[in-house]
């Protein structure tokens, strides 16, 4: 279907910005990969770049306001003409679920004391109200709870005394129209306005004061303009050239309000002085290359040595990355394709270990499936050997940092019958349903 095409995609909010216009195909809009599109106004904004995962949304509110509940967040595969990692189509949501607790305890209601005495009537003449109060302490509520009902109640009271009413003016009425709308007529134009003593009228018994001042006023009409001339549009000018060298742009036609020019306060021409059209160069815009994430580090080795594992011998290792997506003469990726570092190999080395503290509770898994659970662990963590943290490999090249690499074999005393990992699991409570927020808005 035709789409609304925008010139910018805001990564932080996922919103389309800078409307170019509507009614174009996705492919025309996406000749420029900096652009973005919406299938309908206010709908999901998809950027034209190749698909990748959006930032995670903020966590939804906790599913319960007290005690332990669960909350969801999501991210979306956004982009055009491709897939996100994991062979996921654009528009697809991925969810995370975690346990939450807004308030440890749940509120408990309290009870009211008896009502106190009535206070005096609120007025000294005519009718008013009187009030009485009670306290929420029988018993007091717990954990932010409250008592049901109101802490005070009111009722009408009558003093049996009549109040006097003093007169007050209502607002002035509008000025009557001048006898002429343009200057230069035979009579001196005047305008008049009046008001009533009715807001309120003064009372008869007991007598109220009348309104002060006059009930009407008059003035001369001054500064009347010469009679106005309405403006009229001239013809549309030529269409401006397409202002872009690739993708879609916006051209403009202009007209002037000079046929005739408005005079003596006559109305300006109705309608727009410019109108825009989408123009299409049909040329795809350059797409710059983007680095993939770094690959795994290669094994830590030293040339001419069979193995340096479990020894205080520094080696070297490298990792690589690929420049992807460069098209239509876009820029190559800046920076290095290969990364080299110095390392000590502790691959499969038996090392003394110690049990870590409990990790924080993990996410609830599966986030949208049945009976999600969360887990935390204590790990048998290896104590790394005290090898020098820097080395000088070549004279005059200075000190280089050395990193431990590999998966050692840590040895800990058994804990709850386990040698490497102790895990504790708990069910997640009050789990909300996974619902696409875009579909909920429809």
């Amino acid at each position: 279907d035709p789409v609304l095409c925008f010139t910018q995609y805001e990564e932080s909010s996922g919103k389309c910005k800078g409307l170019l216009g509507g009614g174009v195909s996705v492919e025309d809009c996406c000749l420029n990969t900096a652009f973005a599109y919406q299938k309908r106004s206010g709908g999901l904004c998809q950027p034209c770049r190749s698909p990748r995962w959006s930032l995670w949304s903020t966590w939804a509110p906790c599913s319960v306001t007290c005690s332990e509940g669960s909350q969801l967040r999501y991210r979306r595969c956004v982009g055009w003409n491709g897939q996100c990692s994991g062979k996921v189509a654009p528009g697809t949501l991925e969810w995370q679920l975690q346990a939450c607790e807004d308030q440890q305890c749940c509120p408990e209601m309290g009870g009211w004391s008896g009502w106190g005495p009535w206070e005096p009537c609120s007025v000294t003449c005519s009718k008013g109200t009187r009030t009485r109060r009670r306290a929420c302490n029988h018993p007091a509520p717990k954990c932010g709870g409250h008592c049901p009902g109101q802490a005070q109640e009111s009722e009408a009271c009558d003093t049996q005394q009549v109040c006097p009413t003093h007169g007050a003016w209502a607002t002035w009425g509008p000025w009557t129209p001048c006898s002429a709308s343009c200057h230069g007529g035979p009579h001196e134009p005047k305008e008049t306005r009046s008001r009533k003593c009715s807001a309120p009228e003064p009372s008869q018994k007991p007598p109220g004061k009348p309104c002060p001042g006059l009930a009407y006023e008059q003035r001369r009409c001054t500064g009347l303009p010469p009679c106005p001339v309405a403006g009229g549009w001239g013809p549309w000018g030529p269409v401006s050239p397409c202002p872009v060298t690739c993708g879609l742009g916006q051209t403009m036609e202009q007209r002037t309000c000079n046929h005739p020019v408005p005079q003596h306060g006559g109305p300006f021409c109705a309608g727009d002085a410019t109108r825009t059209h989408i123009c299409n160069t049909a040329v795809p815009c350059p797409v710059d290359g983007e680095w993939d994430s770094w690959g795994e580090w290669s094994p830590c080795i030293r040339r001419n040595m069979k193995s340096i594992s479990c020894q205080e011998i520094p080696g070297q290792q490298s990792r690589g990355r690929t420049c992807r997506g460069r098209k239509f003469d876009g820029h190559r990726c800046a920076g290095q394709q290969q990364d080299i570092r110095h390392c000590y190999s502790i691959q499969h080395c038996p090392l003394k270990g110690s049990w870590s503290e409990w990790s924080t509770w993990g996410l609830c898994m599966p986030p949208c499936g049945p009976n999600p659970t969360r887990a935390r662990q204590r790990l048998c963590t290896p104590l790394l050997p005290k090898y020098p943290p820097t080395v000088s490999m070549v004279e005059g090249q200075g000190e280089k940092n050395v990193t431990f690499w590999g998966r050692p074999l840590p040895r800990c005393e058994e804990l709850q019958g386990q040698k490497l990992v102790v895990e504790e699991k708990r069910p997640c409570l009050h789990v909300p349903a996974c619902k696409d927020p875009e579909e909920e808005e429809l």
Epitope: D1, P2, G23, A282
Partner: antibody, heavy 123, light 113 residues
Framework: EVQLQQSGPELVKPGASVKMSCKAS????????IHWVKQKPGQGLEWIGY????????EYSQRFKGKATLTSDKSSSTAYMELSSLTSEDSAVYYC????????????????WGQGTLVTVSA | DIVMTQSPDSLAVSLGERATINCKSS????????????LAWYQQKPGQPPKLLIY???TRESGVPDRFSGSGSGTDFTLTISSLQAEDVAVYYC?????????FGGGTKLEIK
């Protein structure tokens, strides 16, 4: 003058494949999509899909996914359509047509058509 | 898919008379943001490829005689030939380009009475 010159008629056996061409001239080939349309003898028109030679992006009718493959070669200003696993149902005239693009304005109708390639599938 | 239904299937009109061909789509072809109808009309003579007559439902292609006009909006469209000429004998097709797959009407065969 804009022209789309299509390759000649083809007589092919059931199960075989055929690749036809559509050579464009008189405009910038990379700037206009090339659509392909099928017309069985004495019947109406059916859209197969299009290719944008500037980006190599293709869009197919669901009915022709797996049946038709659209490609193009910018250096020779030629678009190609390959039809596979042919049956008698594929016997038809196949047209290529250019997407309309006027004065840089956006449009999607088909303004120039090739003369058509007749494909006959017969044992 | 959007279904395009043309009526009548065939039409015989006297030379110099008005010919009217109708086309109905199964969903609206009017896009609200630009107020354009994504519909074209083509003429096909025997042994020839189709020829574009009208696009955006009512804009005449350059070089097409002004006796051809298109009208309508949303789901109902009309091609009118104000004064039929002998060279107008052909099959006429409407086509939507609102969404993929693009679809054509079944065609209306126009003959001289």
């Amino acid at each position: 003058e804009v022209q789309l010159q299509q390759s000649g008629p083809e007589l092919v056996k059931p199960g075989a494949s055929v690749k036809m061409s559509c050579k464009a001239s008189g405009y910038t080939f990379a700037h206009n999509w090339i659509h392909w349309v099928k017309q069985k003898p004495g019947q109406g028109l059916e859209w197969i899909g299009y290719i944008n030679p500037g980006t190599d992006y293709t869009e197919y009718s669901q009915r022709f996914k797996g049946k038709a493959t659209l490609t193009s070669d910018k250096s020779s200003s030629t678009a190609y359509m390959e039809l596979s696993s042919l049956t008698s149902e594929d016997s038809a005239v196949y047209y290529c047509a250019r997407r309309k693009l006027y004065g840089n304005f956006v449009d999607y109708a088909m303004d120039y058509w090739g003369q058509g390639t007749l494909v006959t599938v017969s044992a | 898919d959007i279904v395009m239904t043309q009526s009548p299937d065939s039409l015989a009109v006297s030379l110099g008379e008005r010919a009217t061909i109708n086309c109905k789509s199964s969903q609206s072809l009017l896009y609200s943001s630009n107020q354009k109808n994504y519909l074209a009309w083509y003429q096909q003579k025997p042994g020839q490829p189709p020829k574009l007559l009208i696009y955006w439902a009512s804009t005449r292609e350059s070089g097409v005689p002004d006796r051809f006009s298109g009208s309508g909006s949303g789901t109902d469209f009309t091609l009118t030939i104000s004064s039929l000429q002998a060279e107008d004998v052909a099959v006429y097709y409407c086509q939507q380009y609102y969404s993929y797959p693009y679809t054509f009407g079944g065609g209306t065969k126009l003959e001289i009475k």
